[in-house]
Each structure stands twice: as structure tokens, then as C-alpha cells.
């Protein structure tokens, strides 16, 4: 290989060992019959050398640095050449470095031809191995602007006082042009300006200077976004840290087209603007940091540009002004991430503050819109608390557990609507009365409706799940001893059509000791499946539940258990079941931890089934499934 550097070229070539490999045989640069591991070639020198091995690219790297002095004479502006040409260099991983020094008052602009650049974060690499590392200067301090790959949106970077650009090319890459030019500009009065151009839909992730380390103190950095007028842009902060400010405040400022309040100032922790039409600027302003404990300011953010959806021009009013203790969250439903570009899906408050999730609280009227290609990617979760603090006032009071129509009219699917029902301890209990009788979901008879009610204890220490219930069964009411949550969960978009079938009334009733009582009025010709709460995990220790099963005069009920034994093993106490005829009070008592479960039994009158648990040993839990079937009476036994 022969490298000749012109006399006044201000180029230095350095060939040195790269990251050491586990290759057994060392390799050397052979020059003047000397075996060396580093070779420096300066301006005006002409040198011939070889390598002592067949694959020097596995051992060596080459750095070509050109110093461009704009201090003492005119600056060589225009397209930057790769000098020496890559065809004259050994096939090693190579880094071309241009170090431009200029006066503080001079702005320098790097202009990148297509493909534009895409910034990458720490630990990331470029698919083709071609990276651009750009740094600036504040007095004597080097500031890293960022590392970039090809195929992005960054078209120009403006700096002042100097710029260092390093282009890294892998040894096998055929590229023979720098892909950028340098132009002079007037002073930009800030650290740098990065221009990002979107031709169509897409996203760009950008970072503050020195990321992930701290942004220089009291500096200003601006990003200019060029967005076609027919598209919409949204900003979201992926990661940020604030430093400890002594004077001034760290902030971001937006110049947004059409805004009457430019610049719009946001704290970094604020929701950032979205649904912006056309070009806009974003600036990051640092502060004077505390000398003792400066902390670090850093920011990584994403700009998403996409077509405005039909929905984005529609405003939806969600009136929660008459609601109390309620919150509504619109958020992305969990999905597997695909690798291709997926347009963002945002919900916007007042059409400006857009984010991937939004929580609305009661007491206000909210105007929302959507910036989303497919609203099925979002869902809604609502929580409402109904609490009674004064038992004298609440007794016999009823509340309708109904999803408000405002919410049903939103173009987003409702996932969960949870009511937290709170009562004063040991003073009141609750009764749930559905508009339509409920069916308990079991493996044997699963619910196939578009929604279900999930009923569970709302006492933090208590792990008690009563079950999942859907309209179209035999459960007339559910009484529970204390605080519960009732969640209406939807399973299909057809819930909108079936919404009329929802309807549950909760009433506060005098306190009772049992954990739960289910009132069951079976219909003829249908088999009712019932199971103990906490199925699969077992009925909690020392818990008692009852089923009040009605039998019409002309019918007989067959009670069938689906196991021979309960399977429970008690550590302390006894587990038992009582089956009691309501008319005669006659009862049968079964020891669940000892006896076999009763064979199918026939009941001509309404009866109780009561199950009470002991403290079981772990792994030997109490789970019971039984069914009730009505058949017409053939002989009148009265």
C-alpha cells in the first residue's frame, strides 16, 4: 500500500490496532522491514507499507483526520471529499475525521445529502456499520452532539466555534463519498440546531447533547422539524433527567405554527404537545447548576409524524362534572411489538396535549380527540368508588352500577369498568341485584356474552374472588359481607349493542357474618353450575359462603357434586357443609375433610347449601363445583 498526503492538506493518517481479537497469530504493519503496530502518516509524507498477515482488517483500523482551519483564513466550504480516496487505502475499518475550528461568531452548518441521518442512543449500532459521530466545542470543552446512522430524518446540523465530524466506514463498505457538505452561517447563539425533515409518515428519536451524560450547563439546543402540512406531529419524552438548578429553570420551548402563545414553554415532566400541523421547533434550555450537587440534565425524545385520522378532527366531550371519585384511563391495549413502523396512537386533551395514555378525573368536563390510525389499539379502563361512611345514612340506599352513556359513546372499546364498593366495617353489608339474572362462569358452562361482572373482595389483605358472572343465568342476587370491587369487563365490541343488558344495583344492607350469600332461582330445563369462590386457589381459611336455592312448587331440584371428596386437608378447625331444607329446617351436615361428598340428592322445597372452611394445609384447598337441575314433580308429596 502506498499513501501519499499532499503537503498542505492538513491530513494525518493513523493505522493502529483495533479492538483485540482472540486470533492466535498477531499481525504487524511492515514498513522498512520493521514490524510495527502503529503507523502515523502526516501531511506531505509518502509512505509504502504492507501487512504481515492475510486479513489485516481483523487487527487494524485506520483513522484519517483532516484539520480545517477557519480561524486564519477562508474556510473551504462546499462538498467534503474523502481524502485520500478509499480506493487508495488498505481495506481496514476506517474513520474519516474532519476537525473544523472557527471563531465563536461563525456558524457552521453540516448538510447531509440523502440518505439523511438517524440518531442512535448508547449501546445501539447501525445496521450497515456506517456511523457519523458529531461533536461541537464550547471553549476548550468537546460536546458530543450525537451518533447517527443513515436512513433517517436529520438533514442539517448547525454549530458554532467548531465542529468535529467522524465518519466510520467498515472495511467492506464501498462508500467513497463523505455524504455531507459544510456551509458557513451567521452565529446561531446556541450550542447547535438540528434540522429533521419528514417527507411522509415516520418517527425520529433524538437526544440532548452528551446523552446519556449531562447536557452542558446553561446551554440551549434547538431541533427544527420540517413536516408536510397535511401530516401531524406529536412529541413524547422517552427518558429525561433534571439537574439541580441554582438559577433559572430547565425547560423546553416550542414554536408551534398557528399558536398565539409562541414560544410555548413546558416543563420536562409535562405532557408534551401533539397533533401539530406543519413545521415546528423544540428547544431545550439548561440552567445554572448547583456547584456542589449539579445533577444532570438529559433528554431523549421521539417525534412521531403521521396522517391525521378521521377521528383527529372530531372532539368528544366526556362530562364527568357530576361524577365523584371516578377516573377514566384511555391507554394502549397490550400487543406484540412488530418491527416495522407502526404509526403512533395518541389520545389528545383539548387537541394539543397528546399522549399514548390519558387519565380523566371526575368533577370536570373534558374535551378529547384521537390521533390514531386504528382505535382498536386503544381501550378504556374506568374506576369509580362508591363509599358509605355513615351507616345510618346509607342503610337501604341503592346505587345503579351502570356505565355512563358518555363513555359508551366514545370510539374506544371499554375494557373494564370497576366499581369499588366500600362499607363501614362490621356495620353494613352489600347486596348486588342484577337487572337480568346472572350465570356463574365455569369450565362446564362458560359465559359467552360480550361482558361479565368480576366480583372480588376489595379488602387489601383478603384474597377472595367470588367469580365471574354474566347475564342469562339463575343467580338473582349476591350478598357480600364487606368491601368489594365489581368490574364490568367487556370481551367483544358487540358490548355496545348489548349494553342494555347491563345493569346492576347495589344496596347497603344490615351487616351479616357470612362472606357471601348467592340467591339462586333456577329455571326449568336448565342446569345451573355453581362453584365456591377463589376457584383454583381454594376458599380462604375460615370463610363461609351460602347458596339460597329456590325450588318452585311443581318442581324438584337435583343437587349434584362433581367430586367424590372435597380434597381439603385441615391444619386447624373443621371444614363442613350443611344442606338445610328451608321449610322443615331439616339439615344434613357433612365433614368435608373426612366424609365423601353426598350423592346426587333431590329437593322438593327451597334449600340452603352452606360451606365453611377450616385452615387448610397448603396445597390441599377447598374447591367445590356443584349443579342444580329442576325437573317437573310427578307425584304431589304434600
Amino acid at each position: 500500500f502506498e499513501i501519499a498526503l499532499p503537503r498542505e492538506s492538513n491530513i494525518t493518517v493513523l493505522i493502529k490496532l483495533g479492538t483485540p481479537t482472540l486470533l492466535a497469530k498477531p499481525c504487524y504493519i511492515v514498513i522498512s522491514k520493521r514490524h510495527i503496530t502503529m503507523l502515523s502518516i502526516k501531511s506531505g509524507e509518502r509512505i509504502v507499507f504492507t501487512f504481515s498477515c492475510q486479513s489485516p482488517e481483523n487487527h487494524f483500523v485506520i483513522e484519517i483526520q483532516k484539520n480545517i482551519d477557519c480561524m486564519s483564513g477562508p474556510c473551504p466550504f462546499g462538498e467534503v471529499q474523502l481524502q485520500p480516496s478509499t480506493s487508495l487505502l488498505p481495506t481496514l475499518n476506517r474513520t474519516f475525521i474532519w476537525d473544523v475550528k472557527a471563531h465563536k461568531s461563525i456558524g457552521l452548518e453540516l448538510q447531509f445529502s440523502i440518505p439523511r441521518l438517524r440518531q442512535i442512543g448508547p449501546g445501539e449500532s447501525c445496521p450497515d456499520g456506517v456511523t457519523h459521530s458529531i461533536s461541537g466545542r464550547i471553549d476548550a470543552t468537546v460536546v458530543r452532539i450525537g451518533t447517527f446512522c443513515s436512513n433517517g430524518t436529520v438533514s442539517r446540523i448547525k454549530m458554532q466555534e467548531g465542529v468535529k465530524m467522524a465518519l466510520h466506514l467498515p472495511w467492506f463498505h464501498p462508500r467513497n463519498v463523505s455524504g455531507f457538505s459544510i456551509a458557513n452561517r451567521s452565529s446561531i447563539k446556541r450550542l447547535c440546531i438540528i434540522e429533521s425533515v419528514f417527507e411522509g409518515e415516520g418517527s425520529a428519536t433524538l437526544m440532548s447533547a452528551n446523552y446519556p451524560e449531562g447536557f452542558p450547563e446553561d446551554e440551549l439546543m434547538t431541533w427544527q422539524f420540517v413536516v408536510p402540512a397535511h401530516l401531524r406531529a406529536s412529541v413524547s419524552f422517552l427518558n429525561f433527567n433534571l439537574s439541580n438548578c441554582e438559577r433559572k429553570e430547565e425547560r423546553v420551548e416550542y414554536y408551534i405554527p398557528g399558536s398565539t402563545t409562541n414560544p410555548e414553554v413546558f416543563k420536562l415532566e409535562d405532557k408534551q404537545p401533539g397533533n401539530m400541523a406543519g413545521n415546528f421547533n423544540l428547544s431545550l434550555q439548561g440552567c445554572d447548576q448547583d456547584a456542589q450537587s449539579p445533577g444532570i440534565l438529559r433528554l431523549q425524545f421521539q417525534v412521531l409524524v403521521q396522517h391525521p385520522q378521521n377521528e383527529s378532527n372530531k372532539i368528544y366531550v366526556v362530562d364527568l362534572s357530576n361524577e365523584r371519585a371516578m377516573s377514566l384511563t384511555i391507554e394502549p391495549r397490550p400487543v406484540k411489538q412488530s418491527r416495522k413502523f407502526v404509526p403512533g396512537c395518541f389520545v389528545c386533551l383539548e387537541s394539543r396535549t397528546c399522549s399514548s395514555n390519558l387519565t380523566l378525573t371526575s368533577g370536570s368536563k373534558h374535551k378529547i380527540s384521537f390521533l390514531c390510525d386504528d382505535l382498536t389499539r386503544l381501550w378504556m379502563n374506568v374506576e369509580k368508588t362508591i363509599s358509605c361512611t355513615d351507616h345510618r345514612y346509607c342503610q337501604r340506599k341503592s346505587y345503579s352500577l351502570q356505565v355512563p352513556s358518555d363513555i359508551l359513546h366514545l370510539p374506544v372499546e371499554l375494557h373494564d369498568f370497576s366499581w369499588k364498593l366500600l362499607v363501614p366495617k362490621d356495620r353494613l353489608s352489600l347486596v348486588l341485584v342484577p337487572a337480568q339474572k346472572l350465570q356463574q362462569h365455569t369450565h362446564e358452562k362458560p359465559c359467552n356474552t360480550s361482558f361479565s361482572y368480576l366480583v372480588a373482595s376489595a379488602i387489601p389483605s383478603q384474597d377472595l374472588y367470588f367469580g365471574s358472572f354474566c347475564p342469562g343465568g339463575s343467580i338473582k342476587q349476591i350478598q357480600v359481607k364487606q368491601n368489594i370491587s365489581v368490574t364490568l369487563r367487556t370481551f367483544a365490541p358487540s358490548f355496545q349493542q348489548e349494553a342494555s343488558r347491563q345493569g346492576l344495583t347495589v344496596s347497603f344492607i344490615p351487616y351479616f357474618k357470612e362472606e357471601g350469600v348467592f340467591t339462586v332461582t333456577p329455571d326449568t330445563k336448565s342446569k345451573v353450575y355453581l362453584r365456591t369462590p377463589n376457584w383454583d386457589r381454594g376458599l380462604p381459611s375460615l370463610t363461609s359462603v351460602s347458596w339460597n336455592i329456590s325450588v318452585p312448587r311443581d318442581q324438584v331440584a337435583c343437587l349434584t357434586f362433581f367430586k367424590e371428596r372435597s380434597g381439603v386437608v385441615c391444619q386447624t378447625g373443621r371444614a363442613f357443609m350443611i344442606i338445610q331444607e328451608q321449610r322443615t329446617r331439616a339439615e344434613e351436615i357433612f365433614s368435608l375433610d373426612e366424609d365423601v361428598l353426598p350423592k346426587p340428592s333431590f329437593h322438593h322445597h327451597s334449600f340452603w347449601v352452606n360451606i365453611s372452611n377450616c385452615s387448610p394445609t397448603s396445597g390441599k384447598q377447598l374447591d367445590l363445583l356443584f349443579s342444580v337441575t329442576l325437573t317437573p314433580r310427578t307425584v304431589d308429596l304434600t
Epitope: S32, I36, I41, T50
Partner: antibody, heavy 119, light 112 residues
Framework: QVTLKESGPGILQSSQTLSLTCSFS??????????VSWIRQPSGKGLEWLAH???????RYNPSLKSRLTVSKGTSRNQVLLKITSVDAADTATYYC???????????WGQGTTLTVSS | DVVMTQTPLTLSVTIGQPASISCKSS???????????LIWLLQRPGQSPKRLIY???KLDSGVPDRFSGSGSGTDFTLKISRVEAEDLGVYYC?????????FGGGTKLEIK
């Protein structure tokens, strides 16, 4: 253009130390691949290579004279020095310095300096 | 040390006639980088030596193309296609592959 010029005492007494200087221009001895060799030629006889100094200060000597030779870079950037201790009549010769670079050896020679050792 | 044996000791040539000098080394001059460091020098009377050929066959700039070098391993030859008056002097071969560098004894070219 490249030039080299040797200078020395001309005459020395036996057992004295010879100090020779090679002053050069047109190249830099800090350039990778560069080197300067010393060669001598007794009158009417053949050439004998003595020592070589590389750009990175690495040195090579003729084993037959190694114990008496020292080659070094001068305080001036454009000089190479050669010292030969305990000279005797056999050291009477014309001493040349010659440049080598990464392309090849001995491409430029000085005009030579003559040394006579009297007993 | 590598011994360089040059023949003939003296060469008497008529102007315009060709001339050939042989140089043999006691071991191969092929270096690990695939190059052979064999040089031909001419020392005209009263002058310092001047390099004519390097790396066996590469002609120095300003050297007439009537000079040519050839050979490999241990056998090398310098040829002058048509001798001219300015060619007289002593020709030396020099190996710089192995330390210590060694010169051939020289071949004196005389004009008949």
C-alpha cells in the same frame, strides 16, 4: 530536494573517539519508514555498512563493530550522529551517510567525509 | 552474515556494447513481506555511490532505461544494454534484507 552532508574531525589520534555528524534536509526523520545508515569505505577498497537509525529511534549495528559504535539523532531535528570509540589505523576511511525510506534503502548519499587515524 | 559474491571483478566493454554483472547471495534475500531488498549502486571515480536499482528491478528516477535488474532468491544480475562512457566506475550490489547489511566486493567497469 533531499541532501545529506557528513562532517567529522578529518584526523584523529589512535584510541580517540570519532564523532561524525550527518546533516540532512528535504525529509524528516520522524516520518514513518525513514532511516539513516552510516557506511564507510577505506581508500581503494569496498563499502562496509556500520549502523542504521530508524524514525522511531530503533537502532541496528554491524556486529563486528557493535561494541564501539553508537548512532543517535542529533539535538537538531535534522542530524544523525555516529560515535566510534578507540579508533585505530584500520578505521581510516571515507564515511558516508545514506537515507532509507519505506520505498527502499540508500536512495540518497552524502558526499562523504574522510578520516585519517594517525598512530 | 550474508555474503555477497560479485562477478566479474573487472569488466572491459566497448562503448555501445552490452554488459552484465552477476551477484550471488549466501542466502535468500526474499523478505517476509514478499519483497527482495537487493540494490545496485554505481560509484564513479572520486564520487559517492549512487543508487541505480532497488528491489531487484526498480529503476531510480533519472537512471537511463539501458540499465535493468533481474533475479530472485540468491541470484541477481545487472545488465547494461549499450554501455556509454558515463557508465564507467565501480558497481556494487547491496542486500538490505538481513542485518548486517552487506555489499558485494564491487565490479569495475572499464571502457575498452
Amino acid at each position: 530536494q533531499v541532501t545529506l552532508k557528513e562532517s567529522g574531525p578529518g584526523i584523529l589520534q589512535s584510541s580517540q573517539t570519532l564523532s561524525l555528524t550527518c546533516s540532512f534536509s528535504g525529509f524528516s526523520l520522524s516520518t514513518a519508514g525513514m532511516g539513516v545508515s552510516w557506511i564507510r569505505q577505506p581508500s581503494g577498497k569496498g563499502l562496509e555498512w556500520l549502523a542504521h537509525i530508524y524514525w522511531d529511534d530503533d537502532k541496528r549495528y554491524n556486529p563486528s563493530l557493535k561494541s564501539r559504535l553508537t548512532v543517535s539523532k542529533g539535538t537538531s531535528r535534522n542530524q544523525v550522529l555516529l560515535k566510534i570509540t578507540s579508533v585505530d589505523a584500520a578505521d581510516t576511511a571515507t564515511y558516508y551517510c545514506a537515507r532509507s525510506d519505506s520505498f527502499g534503502d540508500f536512495d540518497y548519499w552524502g558526499q562523504g567525509t574522510t578520516l585519517t587515524v594517525s598512530s | 552474515d550474508v555474503v555477497m559474491t560479485q562477478t566479474p571483478l573487472t569488466l572491459s566493454v566497448t562503448i555501445g556494447q552490452p554488459a552484465s554483472i552477476s551477484c550471488k547471495s549466501s542466502q535468500s534475500l526474499l523478505y517476509t513481506n514478499g519483497k527482495t531488498y537487493l540494490i545496485w549502486l554505481l560509484q564513479r571515480p572520486g564520487q559517492s555511490p549512487k543508487r541505480l536499482i532497488y528491489l531487484v528491478s526498480k529503476l531510480d528516477s533519472g537512471v537511463p532505461d539501458r540499465f535493468s535488474g533481474s533475479g530472485s532468491g540468491t541470484d541477481f544480475t545487472l545488465k547494461i544494454s549499450r554501455v556509454e562512457a558515463e557508465d564507467l566506475g565501480v558497481y556494487y550490489c547491496l542486500q538490505s534484507t538481513h542485518f548486517p547489511y552487506t555489499f558485494g566486493g564491487g565490479t569495475k567497469l572499464e571502457i575498452k
